[in-house]
Interface confidence: low
């Protein structure tokens, strides 16, 4: 969630001013960013503390500026560090004298485990001395004075992570001040692999993006963004969402960008050279100008963005026909949300093309925790990610960030969440009067602990010795009468306060007990099986009162209709429900129950129910349009069982009219399979769509149906469902 960028301007120090700027783009750190000397990489560098200042041009940025007279103290290795959730992200870079005897080919070099590596330094000063090479400040290699080549190389066959570090080259008579540095980064995994065991295949990172060996995500070069780094930023912008801008006259010229490992450092797109002050030659683009344009159809090559594709073409070489990609946009997200502590299901909604997928949408908490959607659906124009926080608490208040990262680019939107403490009465309710089937209660709802205002109040009650759910009634007055109670039964009472907003039900307050007067008992009855969620069904029944004193229990057998899966559950006799869990979504289950004592009881009739669907419903089938008159028509259809279809929508409009001039008929009883459209215009062509809705969303019609009403005098006609491809 942290987009940390270190700008090294300039790494080769001459007599000009030089600086390091560390930017935490689009991120609000709890702990400050630090810039320091990297003694891990070079132990014997200058010890002077750095003068770190706030970069006034950016909200979350620190800067170190060296004036020209301090040039002698600059050589060495540096880091910028940001911390999130106690975890440090450290970016490393180096500065060296432009007048050094050798200069590195690149400031950093990233290789994969197992690669054959050549680290090279160019000789810029000829001396009659041996050349020496160090790694992290320790001697590793020397070249006799008469054999020092123009290009000094360190060859590392089959590179391993332990080969990583800062390599420096100088003549033996020199010192740190005359040393050249390059840092080798060795990815923990072999090429195109990531993961703890390096057995996952990396996403193809384009435009010289680098696959992170721990996450599999692409680290995009400055000037590119998105899940695969395919999307070019606007001119002179950088950062994970391209929100940061190079303020120089020539954009990002003379800025060396260093990103978290394993990326290392590079120029922004369009620039090359150790100082990033050389423009790309024609036909080349990207960071360090390493990418070659091979644009199809004679398209233009831009040194910053690569091939500039004509409308209807896309891809790095404009090689693919297709709808132009659109950077995602986060929509309908308020700047401030007040939520109640407890379960919270924030929603992130985004547009773009292609539409963001489940994996491409995340939510970042103020402490940096990255949440992934628990539920996801999309329409033609939007993707909706639903996140689940099982228990949100007041310390979770603060700035949350909705983040969307697709091949078409990346966008982040911060929003403020204020978490409220749920109210709870401090006192138990008082019982004023009781009978055999009623009680008069003073609910004593105030004073209470937690946040108001109180929207509503509930009085909860249940028999003490029955393991049944609490019943409740909404109350407006402090005095309330409870009716329909069981005789000779001890009850528990408590009050629950509800504040505004979803999940505003506070924890019930202290409990009061009382007992009703005596009278006879009713018999038990009523098995009921209902879906609770995609993986649970709830079986309920009325309390059981056996005639004998024998111990008893309820045996519940559930089996899947589709799979070879049966489970028997033993439920204590004093319970009146059981939650059948660990089920599969969109699956039909058959349940039966019996009451067992020492002998087994008789099984009940089978009850059947489907778990809720985990996918969009299929389109209604067998769609027919019949009985067409001048002003009406009958539409019939069938739907597939098992998709938790709750309603059918018929959408119709006059052919050729605007999309928004349609009429929606929502049929909330999914068992209805035909509908008469009335009030139609004579001799008019209508476009008719029909789709199904369930707990996940709506089905997607592939075709529209055409309906043409008759002239006023003509007899009804049948139309076998003429299809018009949308």
């Amino acid at each position: 969630a942290m987009d940390l960028i270190l700008i090294n301007s300039l790494p080769l120090v001459s007599d000009a001013e030089t600086s390091l700027t560390c930017i935490a783009s689009g991120w609000r750190p709890h702990e400050p960013i630090t810039i320091g000397r990297d003694f891990e990489a070079l132990m014997n560098q200058h010890q002077d503390p750095l003068e770190v200042t706030q970069d006034v041009t950016r909200e979350w940025a620190k800067k170190v500026v060296w004036k020209r007279e301090k040039a002698s103290k600059i050589n060495g290795a540096y880091f910028c560090e940001g911390r999130v959730r106690g975890e440090a992200i450290r970016i490393r870079t180096m500065k060296m004298r432009q007048q050094a005897s050798f200069l590195p080919a690149t400031l950093t070099m990233t290789v994969d485990k197992g690669d054959n590596v050549n680290i090279s330094f160019k000789k810029v000063l000829i001396k009659e001395e041996d050349a020496v090479i160090y790694k992290n400040g320790s001697f590793i290699h020397s070249v006799p004075r008469h054999e020092v080549p123009d290009i000094l190389e360190v060859h590392l066959p089959h590179a391993q992570p332990q080969d990583a570090g800062v390599y420096s080259a100088r003549y033996i008579g020199g010192n740190l001040f005359t040393s050249a540095f390059t840092r080798l980064i060795v990815r923990r995994c072999e090429a195109q692999k990531w993961g703890p065991e390096c057995n996952h295949l990396c996403t193809a990172c384009m435009n010289n993006g680098v696959c992170h060996e721990d996450t599999g995500e692409c680290i995009c070069p400055p000037g590119f963004m998105g899940r695969t780094c395919e999307k070019a930023c606007e001119l002179h912008t950088f950062g994970r969402t391209c929100k940061e801008r190079c303020s120089g006259q020539e954009g990002c010229k003379s800025y060396v960008f260093c990103l978290p490992d394993p990326y290392g450092c590079s120029c922004a797109t369009g620039w090359k050279g150790l100082q990033c002050n050389e423009a790309c030659h024609p036909g080349f683009y990207g960071p360090d100008c390493k990418l070659r344009c091979s644009c199809n159809n004679g398209e233009m090559c831009d040194r910053f963005q690569g091939c500039l594709c004509s409308p209807g073409w896309q891809g790095l070489q404009c090689e693919r026909e297709g709808i132009q990609r659109m950077t995602p946009k986060i929509v309908d997200l308020p700047d401030h949300i007040e939520v109640n502590s407890g379960k919270f299901n924030p929603i992130c909604k985004a547009s773009g093309w292609p539409l963001p997928t489940n994996e491409e949408m995340t939510l970042v908490k103020p402490d940096g925790t990255v949440l992934h959607p628990k539920d996801f659906n999309h329409t033609d124009h939007f993707s909706v990610a639903i996140f689940t926080i099982h228990r949100i608490l007041p310390p979770d208040s603060g700035v949350w960030v909705c983040s969307v990262n697709t091949v078409a680019g990346m966008v982040e939107k911060p929003f403020n969440i204020s978490v409220k403490v749920l109210p709870k009465p401090l006192n138990a309710p008082n019982v004023i009067d009781t009978g055999h089937n009623f009680a008069v209660i003073n609910i004593s709802s105030e004073p209470y602990f937690g946040d108001g205002p109180i929207k509503s109040k509930k009085l909860l009650y249940k028999p003490v010795n029955h393991y049944e759910a609490w019943q409740h009634i909404q109350v407006t007055n402090e005095i309330v009468t409870l009716n329909y109670l069981e005789p000779r039964t001890e009850y528990e009472l408590c009050v629950q306060l509800v504040r505004r907003g979803e999940g505003g039900e506070g924890h019930p307050g202290p409990v009061r007990r009382f007992t009703t007067a005596s009278i006879g008992l009713p018999p038990p009855r009523g098995l009921n099986l209902l879906p609770k969620s995609q993986t649970t069904l709830n079986l309920t029944w009325q309390p059981i009162f056996p005639s004998s004193e024998d111990d008893f229990y309820v045996e519940v057998e559930r089996r899947s209709v589709q799979k070879s899966d049966q489970q028997n559950i033993k439920v204590p006799g004093n319970l009146t429900s059981v939650l059948l869990n660990n089920l599969h979504p969109r699956e039909q289950y058959v349940v039966r129950a019996r009451v067992n004592t020492k002998a087994q009881g008789e099984w009940s009739e089978d009850l059947t129910a489907w778990t809720l669907s985990d996918i969009l419903p299929p389109q209604p089938e067998n769609i027919k349009i019949s009985n067409i008159t001048h002003s009406s028509a009958v539409i019939s259809w069938t739907i597939l069982d098992g998709y938790s279809i709750s309603s059918i929508t018929i959408r119709y409009k006059v052919q050729g009219k605007n999309e928004d001039q349609h009429v929606d008929v929502k049929i909330k009883n999914a068992t209805i399979t035909q509908y008469q459209l009335k009030g139609l215009e004579p001799e008019t062509a209508y476009q008719v769509d029909i789709f199904a809705e369930n707990n996940i969303g709506s089905s997607n019609p592939a075709f529209s149906h055409e309906l043409v009403t008759l002239p006023e005098s003509q007899a009804p006609a049948d139309l076998g469902g003429g299809k018009m491809l949308l």
Epitope: R559, S564, Q566, Q567, K570
Partner: antibody, heavy 119, light 107 residues
Framework: EVQLVESGGGLVQPGGSLRLSCAAS????????ISWVRQAPGKGLEWVAR????????YYADSVKGRFTISADTSKNTAYLQMNSLRAEDTAVYYC????????????WGQGTLVTVSS | DIQMTQSPSSLSASVGDRVTITCRAS??????VAWYQQKPGKAPKLLIY???FLYSGVPSRFSGSGSGTDFTLTISSLQPEDFATYYC?????????FGQGTKVEIK
């Protein structure tokens, strides 16, 4: 009364073949799964294979995969175990057992038939 | 495959004793465990299914408990006809696998 009666066991040489039968009665044959479970002399129980007579779905233990074939004839309420390329380690009492409704516990077992693989 | 490990492999007890046999699965098998009794030369008989359910016709002195990886068969008061070998079996995944057996002998 539910009954499972195995037959077809006997002495066979290594590499030979044998076909076991399991005649079922007293229950709806196609509404249950039928398994073969074996027990080498003095050893524990080892599941071998199972079939759903209704749709012909079959599953095998790795130790017999490719050598044994389980089948069922719903018209005769009989399950079969065709055993090819027999080895000495296949010597065992072979039981036919019923999984009622689903392949979970074995609620009825046959009396077993002995298969001896020896030269 | 899921391994089912029974202990002890054998035990000696007297009529009237309370006997406990345990079975451990190599991974979570929920309550998909059955217990069988086998006497020499006979086919196994189902005693307990789904970890704790007494199969029809089985005396109530037999009981089962457990879920996840640890399961127990208890005979509350051992009777002469209970001397036999007992097997646990998981049916959580294919292949179903059995424990190696526990032989209950007369002391």
């Amino acid at each position: 009364e539910v009954q499972l009666v195995e037959s077809g066991g006997g002495l066979v040489q290594p590499g030979g073949s044998l076909r076991l039968s399991c005649a079922a009665s007293g229950f709806t044959f196609s509404g249950s799964w039928i398994s073969w479970v074996r027990q080498a002399p003095g050893k524990g129980l080892e599941w071998v294979a199972r079939i759903n007579p209704y749709d012909g779905n079959t599953y095998y233990a790795d130790s017999v995969k490719g050598r044994f074939t389980i089948s069922a004839d719903t018209s005769k309420n009989t399950a079969y175990l065709q055993m090819n390329s027999l080895r000495a380690e296949d010597t065992a009492v072979y039981y036919c057992a019923r999984n009622n409704r689903f392949p979970t516990w074995f609620d009825y077992w046959g009396q077993g038939t002995l298969v001896t693989v020896s030269s | 495959d899921i391994q089912m490990t029974q202990s002890p492999s054998s035990l000696s007890a007297s009529v009237g004793d309370r006997v406990t046999i345990t079975c451990r699965a190599s991974q979570d098998v929920s309550t998909a465990v059955a217990w069988y009794q086998q006497k020499p030369g006979k086919a196994p008989k189902l005693l307990i299914y789904s970890a704790s359910f007494l199969y029809s016709g089985v005396p109530s002195r037999f009981s089962g408990s457990g879920s996840g990886t640890d399961f127990t068969l208890t005979i509350s008061s051992l009777q002469p006809e209970d001397f036999a070998t007992y097997y646990c079996q998981q049916s959580y995944t294919t292949p179903p696998t059995f424990g190696q057996g526990t032989k209950v002998e007369i002391k």
